[in-house]
């Protein structure tokens, strides 16, 4: 969950408790099991590049 008092993440990004910051949903293509990817499921990600593991 996002920490209380912090601004919501911008469109195309989602909060990561593991990293303690908003993360670009496009990153879910690199690592689909990242904690923030659940919050990305409803919104299409920003444009992405090919990814590495």
């Amino acid at each position: 969950e996002q920490a209380p008092g912090t601004a919501p993440c911008s469109r195309g990004s989602s909060w990561s408790a593991d990293l303690d910051k908003c993360m670009d949903c496009a990153s879910c293509r690199a690592r689909p099991h990242s904690d923030f990817c659940l919050g990305c499921a409803a919104a299409p990600p920003a444009p992405f590049r090919l990814l590495w593991p």
Epitope: A17, D18, L19, M23, R29, P32, H33, P53
Partner: antibody, heavy 120, light 112 residues
Framework: QVQLVQSGAEVKKPGASVKVSCKAS????????IAWVKQAPGQGLEWIGE????????YYSEKFRGKATLTADTSTSTAYMELSSLRSEDTAVYFC?????????????WGQGTLVTVSS | DIVMTQSPLSLPVTPGEPASISCRSS???????????LYWYLQKPGQSPQLLIY???NRASGVPDRFSGSGSGTDFTLKISRVEAEDVGVYYC?????????FGQGTKVEIK
């Protein structure tokens, strides 16, 4: 350039503990995951667990929960793995590896490995 | 946990000839986003593993084009079009679909 430099070989007695270090350089330490992988003599690769250095959040393989403890020191950009209650089957080379969560990642990086020998 | 199974476990090769390694996963590595999370690593003697192929078919930076990856959701192949002496070592398949991160048993490639 990105580098992961691990501490030197260790010889320990059964029942003892050992702490292996992995010093990162060439990138922002808190932006990437550090994973630890075991390779027993003549065997394959086995994931132990991983840590998010910025928050200290950890994920462990069930097999290594209680055996390995992962920590990170952001002031020195160093990740650590401590193995407790050592037994002969813990004799192995242990690797740290940088893993990504980013879409613009350019390859992965591994430390050179640390040989831990458990012998009475 | 996803189980990765490789074959053969040992592969004697002749320089200049093609070689092929198979890997099977216990569940599909094809994600709903269309990406297949299968990776190939090479561990040369006395060295750390190095990434060869990511997401089933993409060559990592600096990897020669004689290496190629292909497959479906559960069955994968690494091909070396013309083996060179420097290609010897142990090849591992692995997945990145979920935790735990698991590897195949490894295929040892050696020159005949």
């Amino acid at each position: 350039q990105v580098q992961l430099v691990q501490s030197g070989a260790e010889v320990k007695k059964p029942g003892a503990s050992v702490k292996v270090s992995c010093k990162a350089s060439g990138y922002t330490f808190t932006d990437f995951i550090i994973a630890w992988v075991k390779q027993a003599p003549g065997q394959g690769l086995e994931w132990i667990g991983e840590i998010y250095p910025g928050t200290g959040r950890t994920y462990y393989s069930e097999k290594f929960r209680g055996k390995a403890t992962l920590t990170a020191d952001t002031s020195t950009s160093t990740a650590y793995m401590e193995l407790s209650s050592l037994r002969s089957e813990d004799t192995a080379v242990y690797f740290c590896a940088r893993r990504t969560i980013y879409y613009d990642y350019d390859g992965d990086y591994w430390g050179q490995g640390t040989l831990v020998t458990v012998s009475s | 946990d996803i189980v990765m199974t490789q074959s053969p476990l040992s592969l004697p090769v002749t320089p200049g000839e093609p070689a092929s390694i198979s890997c099977r996963s216990s569940q599909s590595l094809l994600h709903s986003n269309g990406i297949t999370y299968l990776y190939w690593y090479l561990q040369k003697p006395g060295q750390s593993p190095q990434l060869l192929i990511y997401q089933m078919s993409n060559r990592a930076s600096g990897v020669p084009d004689r290496f190629s990856g292909s497959g479906s959701g559960t069955d994968f192949t690494l091909k070396i079009s013309r083996v060179e002496a420097e290609d010897v070592g142990v090849y591992y398949c692995a997945h990145n679909l979920e935790l735990p991160w698991t590897f195949g048993q490894g295929t040892k490639v050696e020159i005949k």
